[in-house]
């Protein structure tokens, strides 16, 4: 009797199990009682990355420089092109269809993780004992100056945005 299910890398059509096309090839014709599945390679600008019965290959992704994109890895008949962002930019989404500038960490925040082509800057609040007085995509929170090691005393306490202000010790005692 005709099959109702097929093996791996096969598909059921017209009560027959036909071989799927291998990655990098598209389906031209289903198999028959007398012939194998007919497949053709994808053209240079196209790909298919799985065993398939697609009648059209997918177009390689275009890395549009107007959107801040560049080619990280050229596509093949079996893989899509991988885009990444130009220096100073990162992908807006996982699919990386466009890029946006890395965000800077505002005063009071420091860089926890520097941005990459695919991830934005990660900022963290400066904890007690640390500060950041600049808006930067690179600078971490810096520790307050240690007045004691300079034989000075704290004249003005530090905040998450400002360093402590050191001054000479009062010698009029």
């Amino acid at each position: 009797e005709p099959p109702t299910a097929c093996r791996e890398k096969q598909y059921l059509i017209n009560s027959q199990c036909c071989s799927l096309c291998q990655p990098g090839q598209k389906l031209v014709s289903d198999c028959t009682e007398f012939t194998e599945t007919e497949c053709l390679p994808c053209s240079e600008s196209e790909f298919l990355d799985t065993w398939n019965r697609e009648t059209r290959c997918h177009q390689h992704k275009y890395c549009d420089p107007n959107l801040g994109l560049r080619v990280q890895q050229k596509g093949t008949s079996e893989t899509d092109t991988i885009c990444t962002c130009e220096e100073g930019l990162h992908c807006m989404s996982e699919s990386c269809e466009s890029c946006v500038p890395h965000r800077s960490c505002l005063p009071g925040f420091g860089v926890k993780q520097i941005a990459t082509g695919v991830s934005d800057t990660i900022c963290e609040p400066c904890p007690v004992g640390f500060f950041s007085n600049v808006s930067s995509a690179f600078e971490k929170c810096r520790p307050w100056t240690s007045c004691e090691t300079k034989d000075l005393v704290v004249q003005q306490a530090g905040t998450n945005k400002t360093d402590v202000v050191c001054g000479p010790q009062d010698r009029q005692r």
Partner: antibody, heavy 112, light 112 residues
Framework: QVQLQESGPGLVKPSDTLSLTCAVS?????????WNWIRQPPGKGLEWIGY???????NYNPSLKNRVTMSVDTSKNQFSLKLSSVTAVDTAVYYC?????WGQGTLVTVSS | DVVMTQSPLSLPVTLGQPASISCRSS???????????LNWFQQRPGQSPRRLIY???NRFSGVPDRFSGSGSGTDFTLKISRVEAEDVGVYYC?????????FGQGTKLEIK
Amino acid sequence: QVQLQESGPGLVKPSDTLSLTCAVSGYSITTNYYWNWIRQPPGKGLEWIGYIKYDGSNNYNPSLKNRVTMSVDTSKNQFSLKLSSVTAVDTAVYYCARLDYWGQGTLVTVSS
Amino acid sequence: DVVMTQSPLSLPVTLGQPASISCRSSQSLENSNGNTFLNWFQQRPGQSPRRLIYKVSNRFSGVPDRFSGSGSGTDFTLKISRVEAEDVGVYYCLQVTHVPFTFGQGTKLEIK
């Protein structure tokens, strides 16, 4: 329902070219089937002559050497056979077939 | 070429009794995808060949279930579980795994 119908002269002179056409109805010829020619000399078994596909790709029986030419006309949904330099041994019923469907056959006699 | 050898060439059978036809190929008919393109055809007197079995054991639609095919590699069998009067004719195996396609020489089934 798929139907195949052979047509062509029933009598061919020795050394001439035998020409037959097969009209296909009920199914488009532009599919992944082999469109075959098979012959059967009187009182004998079946002999495969060759096949052609919708894209013109073909395979012929080497025993018929370089005498066979097949063509396909997708606009008319038909395919054809030419067999050159015929002799009496080419006298046979000629079938066109998709293998699951066959024409009724046409007897071609080679005689002067 | 792949040589297809059928046996017996003549098969007298009593109505209602089983019948078995063997077909052997000179090389394996299994292709790289694991498919074996071995077919069986019936040719009743004065008619075109009719499809029975494809890919060793698959019955074409409309073929009675008293017909069954089996085998693998180079050894194949067509069985008729209970022969009926309408089964009289010549039975051919055909391989379409290798080009040129080749038929067996035919087995003539007749009623005793």
